[in-house]
């Protein structure tokens, strides 16, 4: 019997209301051993992977998603989950990004709500793939 | 995709989608349909350890559940409008569980009495 | 509601000449949008993903473009292997949606 994989936990540095413009960084923890971290947006199919990981503390690994400059497109519910072969873990509790106009900063360009400002680490286009030798490119893939 | 064929209204039915060369545990797995000679329609997906999100109007009627190498799609209180050709679609390419790269053939439902 | 609204329905053109379908989202969805060509008897085939990316084994000759809410499919250098039903595809929002395709342009070569 395999062992339930502990929820992941989720939470935003420097904090969950942020100035337009300003940076913010999404934390997402599990246990050792996690490959991918995956941050997720509520009601989206679209998301954030990384196998960026490093070892919080000897129980706990991390993985970190900047936006480097919020826009109020990215205010909204945010949420973590990881992969750790062979098994996904259960979602971590949402956490609500909020995005205030800044006191007299510089403009930055507005995005409207529901667009797809993610963070900026892009994850390259087989993050999706499985974590297999290269030669699994040999192999052909099938719907039947 | 099996299962398929023809069904009186009223009923339930189970199709399945088998995956070779992958595991679909890592993949967004999509279900969706296309009416005769109309366009297709988005029924829902199901990711990671049993994740799915529906269309609105198969909340309730329609269940997207897996394995490690099939995706089931149960259908219940079938209708006339339910008939047409039903697909399964892996996504995930480019960052989005809607772009579906790798598609089925697809499989006839047939609802009649 | 997100709806998808594709334009024309149907376009014939040509072998060698040039396509532009229109796809317009009513909300603004980034480069969140994909777009599909589906021949009779067989399933869709994905072409361009995040608006304007080539996927893997698509000619050249398709190519997409757009962001927020209006977005072109070009089909250049017409061939017959082209007469197909073409979707576009919001691939952002799955909470809270009818369907997440446009309703289709048939393009046929002359």
């Known amino acids: 019997q395999e062992e339930d994989l502990p929820r992941p936990s989720i939470s935003a540095e420097p904090g969950t209301v942020i100035p337009l413009g300003s940076h913010v960084t999404f934390v997402c923890r599990g246990p050792v051993g996690v490959q991918t971290f995956r941050l997720e947006r509520d009601s989206r199919s679209t998301y954030n992977d990384t196998e960026d990981v490093s070892q919080a503390s000897p129980s706990e690994s991390e993985a970190r998603f900047r936006i480097d400059s919020v826009r109020e497109g990215n205010a909204g519910l945010y949420r973590c989950i990881y992969y750790k072969p062979p098994k996904w873990s259960e979602q971590s509790d949402y956490l609500e990004l909020l995005v205030k106009e800044s006191s007299g900063g510089p403009d930055s360009p507005d995005t409207e709500p529901g667009s797809s400002a993610g963070p900026t680490q892009r994850p390259s286009d087989n993050s999706h793939n499985e974590h297999a030798p290269a030669s699994q490119g040999l192999k052909a893939e099938h719907l039947y | 995709e099996s299962g398929g064929g023809l069904i009186t209204p009223g009923g339930t039915l189970t199709l399945t989608c088998t995956a070779s060369?992958?595991?679909?545990?890592?993949?967004?797995m999509n279900w969706v349909r296309q009416a005769p000679g109309k366009g297709l329609e988005w029924i829902g997906y199901?990711?990671?350890?049993?994740k799915t999100y529906y269309a609105n109007w198969a909340k309730g009627r329609f269940t997207i559940s897996k394995t490690s190498t099939t995706v089931d799609l149960k259908m219940t209180s079938l209708t006339a409008e339910d008939t047409g050709t039903y697909f399964c679609?892996?996504?995930?390419?480019?960052?989005?569980?809607?772009?579906?790269?790798?598609w089925g053939p697809g499989t006839l439902v047939t609802i009649s009495s | 509601e997100l709806v998808l609204t594709q334009t024309p329905a149907s376009v014939s053109e040509p072998v060698g000449g040039t396509v532009t379908i229109k796809c317009q989202a009513s909300?603004?969805?980034?480069?969140?949008l994909a777009w599909y060509q589906q021949k009779p008897g067989q399933p869709p085939k994905l072409l361009i993903y995040?608006?304007?990316r080539l996927a893997s084994g698509v000619s050249s000759r398709f190519g997409g473009s757009g962001s927020g809410t209006e977005f072109t499919l070009t089909i250049s250098d017409l061939e017959c292997a082209d007469a197909a039903t073409y979707y576009c595809?919001?691939?952002?929002?799955?909470?809270?949606?009818?369907?997440?395709f446009g309703g289709g342009t048939e393009v046929v070569v002359k």
């Open positions: 595809q919001q691939a952002e929002y799955s909470g809270d949606v009818e369907n997440t």
């Open positions: 199901i990711y990671a350890s049993s």
């Open positions: 679609a892996r996504g995930g390419v480019g960052n989005s569980g809607l772009n579906l790269d790798l």
């Open positions: 060369g992958f595991t679909v545990t890592r993949y967004y």
């Open positions: 995040q608006a304007s």
């Open positions: 909300q603004s969805i980034g480069s969140w």
